[in-house]
Every structure is written in structure tokens, then in C-alpha cells.
């Protein structure tokens, strides 16, 4: 007997699609080998149909797919439009040919039935409503009109033309008829629920001169969709639940055994599960709407369920829409920690992944706000102008290629703990998101700037330095100058080469930079920070504001253009071998936000279109030098 | 809550047939799956056959033991599932449960099912 698993016999009709589980032996080897699906013919050979490698033949061509899951040990074969030619023998099996492990599938697929002719058949999803139309000759006009359903004895009352209507139809079931034709009479049936379900007999008139007409109804459970996600990625559930439900509460729940339980809802509810990871979304004013988690885990698989009613909980009778999540945990999106701490005064650097054939989409960073029904605004982007109440602290720093940005954020309170997320205009699976956690600050920050309050004075000299400690010694310094469009590092270079010592004295580490001369554009918000490569670190900020200079201080000739301004870093030599990762801060954004927050922030970034990228030189009319000089103590 | 009824179980010679169905009743919404088990004495359940079903479309397992012996169906409009068991084997004897759920994984796992019937006796006699 094969170790292979599937179901034997699969029976479909035309048009209709079939999802083929397989399951196979929880071993490393098959979890990483060939998955594939082949025809087996009558020579006993077995056609590869699709397969796990990338092979798809011809007539599953733009039809078909098949999706390892290593984590369930299984693997899914989906098949839409089928026809009557798919109809056959088959085997879904592994290993590098088709004599490998496997197992036989038989799939049958047949015309769509033919239906009586007497029986007027009606289709209908659970919660729905149905208008059963019910014709009849006019000498029947002045008689009693009725509908009953079958029984398998005799034919019980639903409603009549005389208001009687059975208790269970009370409230759903409404008999008319429309203007001045006499010759017709309707039925509507409201909230249907699987025990409406069956054969009906509308009636006008009595005894043999009665018009009769059969009707079949049939309520649906509503498909199960089937979604195929990635660790870590984001889903959408567009719910579409019609007008008649429109004014009406939404929700989305989860299967758990009997209940569906509630994962968010329109009227404030959500599953702490989910915090800081999804959105639900009024779409229109016809009952549409989505819901966006993010950030999706393995537990997350499992069968969910939106609705609307009254309440904002699940109602037999009331419409739905169902979808079966599965997490593939073969995830193209990279893991990351998903919490970043900071302190109180620090700074926090997240990197947030992008998908990295996508290096030129528009990046934004957007907190998560949890209250009514959930939104993101966006904070910075890199054609989205930083947010007011984020100046002097916030940038983001796009480094085109590496499938990363990072955003800074730095002067941290206890106010910005939360939760971020990192999306771009592009491929939706990589939003991502992070919980930033602040603590008090219980000792000094590793980066320091003197002075404290920077006041320059017009035309003249200015320096303010920025003191780390000996474990950045091996990594980049730099200064920038903030501005709502990203923080412009200004340029230095090296002019001497490194030479190592062997103390390292804390007090003497320090980094300048000289303004000079002062100019009326040089005041504003100035980050001192450090890297290492690509990888942003620790940054600290500071202002520097602009005096015009007062009277009796000293004149100072205005240099060459330029030498305007002089930036000069000035650091300290210690051993390089020390070289402590703290604090960096890299985060696991786990992926999300919203469709229409997305539109929004699209909207935004035509607004603040900027001339240039955040970090890149951000429009300043003066040039900057910088000089690198190493002193020995 | 579900409720599941079976019917059909009784004493039989080996080389017979028998039918058992499984009327489920109640709120069958979220149910796509619904199967057969078997307990006999002093053994573990285990799984014997299963039908899921998506639309229009079924799916069929069936354990090996039973393949090509036994076969699941479904009837919609009475939320009746059957087995039908030919060629019997003194083997075959247990208690026979109905199981019912959403059955969203492995359908030969227990958990996988939210709701049982009380069971029925199949026996078996050479």
C-alpha cells in the first residue's frame, strides 16, 4: 500500500473547478521533493500534467496549479473549467520521475443535469431571499392563492392569500401581487436557512379546475473560496453581501467547532489575536466590504466567515460568505522580529522589507490605529511629506535594490509605542508590520549632542558636537539635515588614514559638525547617527536655531561658495574590535494594510510629490564639505 | 449544534452486504464533510471512509482496508450520507460512527470532525 494519501474518487461537473488534497510521510526528503500530478494512460505510462518543479503542460495551461504545503505535509492540485475530456485516471505522487510514490485518483466529471421541465427550479445562498412566481388562469383570479412545501405526506401551508401564514414563516414570508396583472401571484421567502430547502406547490383556485405549478428550492451554503497565502504576507477578504444588508453590521468571524467566533466586527469588536494587524473596511453603500490581516502566522489557516446583522455576531438565515485560509510557511518574505523596543529620548531604525523586484515603488511607513473600524495613516513615504507632529524625528531612507527602506524615529515617548506598519504602492504581500515597545529610560543615551540648546549666530562659526561610545567606534558616523522630505546626510571625507589605540577613553569619542559660515537656511533639525554599511543604527537629534548676531561681536569675512558650509567630523581612534549590536533595532515588520488606505496614501503621495528621495540631497542651495581628522590623546 | 442518527447496523454472514445511512439534522451550515468510522472491541476508532464536498463537487477517501469493497455517497436534500458495505469480512465487525464537520485537513483524523453519532453495530459472523 502507497503512504500516499488523496481521495480516491473525485466527482465534478463542467465548468466547475476541484481542489485535490495529497498528503504524504512527514520526512525532510518529501517535504523538499517533486510534487506532481500526471494522467495515467493505457499503456499504463503516467503523463505529468503539473508539477512541483514548474512544468505545466499545455491543457492545464492558465487552469491549474499546484501548491506544496511542507508545514501539513500535503500538497494541493487545482483544477478550474473542467470538461467532460478531464474525465480519467490519475495519480498525484513524488519523487524525481512518475514511478515514484503515489496514488490513485479516479476524476469524473459529468454534464450539468437536466431538470424536469414541470419543476421550476430556484437557486438560492443561505440568508437570501427568493420571489417564487406562481401563474394561474384568470377564472381562478377571485380564488385563494398558496403556497405549501412538500412533506413526505402531504403538502403543509407556507402562506395564503387570506393571511394565513405557518409559524415558521412569520416575518419571511410575503404572498402578492404585482400592478393589475391577474394572472400571476408571488411568493418572496426572506432569511433563507437550509431547512427551507425543497419542494413547493403554488396553488390558485380549488379541485381540478386548481393551477398548480412545482417548484423546487434549493439554499446554498455558500462556497468555501479557497486562499493560498504566505507566512508572514497579508489577505484580504472582500465580503459582498448585497444591498439589502447594506445598513446592517458587518463582520468576519472564524470557524471553531460549533461557533464562529468573532475576529472584528463594524460595531468595535475585535480579537486581541489581531491587534495592530487588521482593518475592516466599509466599501461602498451595496454592503460591500474588506477586511485586511496582516502579518499572517501559521494559526492563522483555518475557515472564516463574513455576515451582517443587526448585532454584529452570526445570525442563521442571514447572508454569508465563507473562505478557507491556508499558510504556506515556504515564505518568500523575510522573517524578521516583529517587536523593536526603544527607550524614552532614544531612537528606534526598522527595517522594512520590500519585494525586491520592485525597488522603485513608492515606500510608506503608516501607524496602525485601532480605534472604530481601524486605520493606517500614513506618517512618512518617500513621495509623502513627514506629518507635522513627526518633525525633526521621523525619516525614512530608501536604498534602492536591497529589498529594504528604513524608516527612523527617534526623540521616542511612551506616546509612540504601537504598532507600524511598512507597505509600498506595489506587491501587497509585503506590508509588514512591527510593535514598537518604549521603556523609560533608565540610563544615558549612547549618542549625545553639546551644546543642548544650539543657538547659531548669522555669519559666523558653528559646531556642535555628538559623543558615542567606544562600541560604535567601527561603525559610519554621519550628520544629516532633517527636513519633511527625508534626512540629507551631508557629505564628509576621510582625509587620514585609521590608526588604532589600544584604550579607548569614553569621553573623547566624538563626531562634529562645523557650520560655517552661518546661514539663515541652516537652521532647523540636524540627526547625528551611525551605521555600518546599509544598516542604520542609534540617531539623535538636534536644533539649531538661527540668530541674527548682535551688536559688538566680532565680523567674520564670508568665505568662498564652497567653503559656506564645512561640516567636520571629527573622531576619536579606538581598537575596532569592539564592536557591540545593540539596540539596532531591525525589526520583523509581519505584513499588512489596507486597500483603501493604500488609494489614500497613493492620493497623498501625488500631493507631496517631492523633488527627490528621502536621504538622497534634498533640494539645499548650499554645498557642503566635510573633513575627517583624527586625534591622538 | 448538528445531530447525527445512524441506521442500517445488524448481524450479517460474511460475503454479504449492508447499508448503513447517517441523517444529520440541525445547524449543518459549516458542514463539508461527513465520514465513517469504526471502533471494534478492545481496538482504537478508525478511520474507515469519508465524503467531502465543495458545490457540485465530491471527494471520496476511502482506508484501505475497505477499498473497492465499501462505498460512501450523499444525498443533499435529505442531509443523508450512506455506506454501502459488500463483500463483508468477520473483520469488518465493530461499532460503525458517524462523524460530521468542516473537515478542512486530513479527513482520516479524528479531530477533524465536530460532531458524532451514537454508533451502530455491524457484526459479522464466518
Known amino acids: 500500500k502507497s503512504p500516499i494519501f488523496g481521495p480516491q474518487e473525485v466527482s465534478s461537473i463542467e465548468g466547475d473547478s476541484v481542489s485535490i488534497t495529497c498528503y504524504y510521510p512527514d520526512t525532510s526528503v518529501n517535504r523538499h521533493t517533486r510534487k506532481y500530478w500526471c494522467r495515467q494512460g493505457a499503456s499504463g505510462m503516467c503523463t505529468t500534467l503539473i508539477s512541483s518543479n514548474g512544468y505545466l503542460s499545455k491543457e492545464y495551461s492558465g487552469r491549474a496549479n499546484l501548491i506544496n504545503f511542507p508545514e501539513n505535509n500535503t500538497f494541493v492540485i487545482n483544477i478550474e473549467q473542467l470538461t467532460q475530456d478531464d474525465t480519467g485516471s490519475y495519480k498525484c505522487g513524488l519523487g524525481t520521475s512518475n514511478r515514484g510514490l503515489s496514488f490513485d485518483v479516479s476524476l469524473e466529471v459529468s454534464q450539468v443535469p437536466e431538470l424536469p421541465s414541470d419543476t421550476h427550479v430556484y437557486t438560492k445562498d443561505i440568508g437570501r431571499n427568493v420571489t417564487i412566481e406562481c401563474p394561474f388562469k384568470r377564472e381562478n383570479a377571485p380564488s385563494k392563492k398558496s403556497l405549501c412545501k412538500k412533506t413526505n405526506q402531504s403538502c403543509e401551508l407556507v402562506i395564503d392569500s387570506t393571511e394565513k401564514v405557518n409559524p415558521s414563516y412569520i416575518g419571511r414570508a410575503k404572498l402578492f401581487m404585482k400592478g393589475t396583472d391577474l394572472t400571476v401571484f408571488y411568493v418572496n421567502i426572506s432569511h433563507l436557512t437550509h431547512n427551507d430547502a425543497g419542494l413547493y406547490i403554488c396553488q390558485a383556485g380549488e379541485g381540478p379546475s386548481a393551477d398548480k405549478k412545482n417548484v423546487d428550492l434549493q439554499v446554498l451554503a455558500p462556497e468555501p473560496e479557497l486562499l493560498y497565502k504566505d507566512l508572514r504576507s497579508s489577505v484580504t477578504f472582500e465580503c459582498d453581501l448585497g444591498r439589502e444588508v447594506a445598513n446592517e453590521a458587518k463582520y468576519l468571524c472564524r470557524m471553531n467547532k460549533e461557533t464562529c467566533d468573532v475576529i472584528i466586527n463594524t460595531l468595535g469588536k475585535r480579537d486581541p489575536d489581531f491587534e495592530g494587524r487588521i482593518l475592516i473596511t466599509p466599501k461602498d453603500d451595496n454592503g460591500r466590504f474588506s477586511v485586511l490581516i496582516t502579518g499572517l502566522r501559521k494559526e492563522d489557516a483555518g475557515h472564516y466567515q463574513c455576515g451582517a446583522h443587526s448585532s454584529g455576531l452570526p445570525q442563521e438565515g442571514w447572508p454569508i460568505q465563507t473562505w478557507q485560509l491556508f499558510v504556506n510557511e515556504e515564505s518568500t518574505i523575510p522573517n524578521r522580529r516583529s517587536v523593536v523596543k526603544g527607550v524614552t529620548g532614544g531612537s528606534v531604525a526598522i527595517a522594512c522589507p520590500y519585494n525586491p523586484k520592485e525597488s522603485s515603488s513608492l515606500k510608506y511607513w503608516c501607524r496602525w490605529e485601532g480605534d472604530g473600524n481601524g486605520h493606517c495613516p500614513v506618517l512618512v513615504g518617500t513621495q509623502a511629506q513627514v506629518q507635522e507632529e513627526y518633525e525633526g524625528r521621523l525619516a525614512l531612507f530608501d536604498q534602492p535594490g536591497n529589498g529594504t527602506y528604513t524608516v527612523i524615529l527617534n526623540q521616542l515617548t511612551t506616546e509612540d509605542a504601537g504598532f507600524y506598519w511598512c507597505l509600498t504602492n506595489g506587491d501587497s504581500r509585503w506590508r509588514t508590520t512591527i510593535e514598537l515597545q518604549v521603556a523609560e529610560a533608565t540610563r544615558e543615551p549612547n549618542l549625545e549632542v553639546t551644546p543642548q540648546n544650539a543657538t547659531a549666530v548669522l555669519g559666523e562659526t558653528f559646531t556642535v558636537s555628538c559623543h558615542y561610545p567606544c562600541k560604535f567606534y567601527s561603525q559610519e558616523k554621519y550628520w544629516c539635515k532633517w527636513s519633511n522630505k527625508g534626512c540629507h546626510i551631508l557629505p564628509s571625507h576621510d582625509e587620514g588614514a585609521r590608526q588604532s589605540s589600544v584604550s579607548c577613553d569614553q569621553s573623547s569619542q566624538l563626531v562634529s559638525m562645523t557650520l560655517n559660515p552661518v546661514s539663515k537656511e541652516d537652521e532647523g533639525w540636524y540627526w547625528c547617527g551611525v551605521k555600518q554599511g546599509q544598516t542604520y543604527g542609534e540617531t539623535t537629534a538636534i536644533y539649531i536655531a538661527v540668530e541674527e548676531r548682535t551688536r559688538g561681536s566680532s565680523h567674520v569675512n564670508p568665505t568662498d561658495a564652497n567653503a559656506r558650509a564645512k561640516v567636520a567630523l571629527e573622531e576619536e581612534v579606538v581598537d575596532s574590535s569592539i564592536s557591540e549590536k545593540e539596540n539596532k533595532a531591525i525589526p520583523n515588520p509581519g505584513p499588512f494594510a489596507n486597500e483603501r488606505e493604500i488609494q489614500n496614501v497613493g492620493d497623498q503621495a501625488q500631493e507631496n510629490r517631492a523633488s527627490g528621495d528621502a536621504g538622497s540631497a534634498d533640494g539645499q542651495s548650499r554645498s557642503s564639505s566635510s573633513k575627517h581628522h583624527h586625534h591622538h590623546h | 449544534e448538528v445531530q447525527l442518527v445512524e441506521s442500517g447496523g445488524g448481524l450479517v454472514q460474511a460475503g454479504d452486504s449492508l447499508r448503513l445511512s447517517c441523517a444529520a439534522s440541525g445547524r449543518t451550515l459549516t458542514t463539508y464533510g461527513m465520514g465513517w468510522f469504526r471502533q471494534a472491541p478492545g481496538k482504537e476508532r478508525e478511520f474507515v471512509a469519508t465524503i467531502k464536498w465543495s458545490g457540485s463537487t465530491n471527494y471520496k477517501y476511502y482506508a484501505d482496508s475497505v477499498k473497492g469493497r465499501f462505498t460512501i455517497s450523499r444525498d443533499n436534500a435529505k442531509n443523508t450520507v450512506y455506506l454501502q458495505m459488500n463483500s463483508l469480512k468477520p473483520e469488518d465487525t465493530a461499532v460503525y460512527y458517524c462523524?460530521?464537520?468542516?473537515?478542512?485537513?486530513?479527513?482520516?483524523?479524528?479531530?477533524?470532525?465536530?460532531?458524532w453519532g451514537q454508533g451502530t453495530l455491524v457484526t459479522v459472523s464466518s
Open positions: 462523524a460530521a464537520g468542516t473537515v478542512l485537513g486530513d479527513p482520516r483524523v479524528l479531530n477533524e470532525y465536530d460532531y
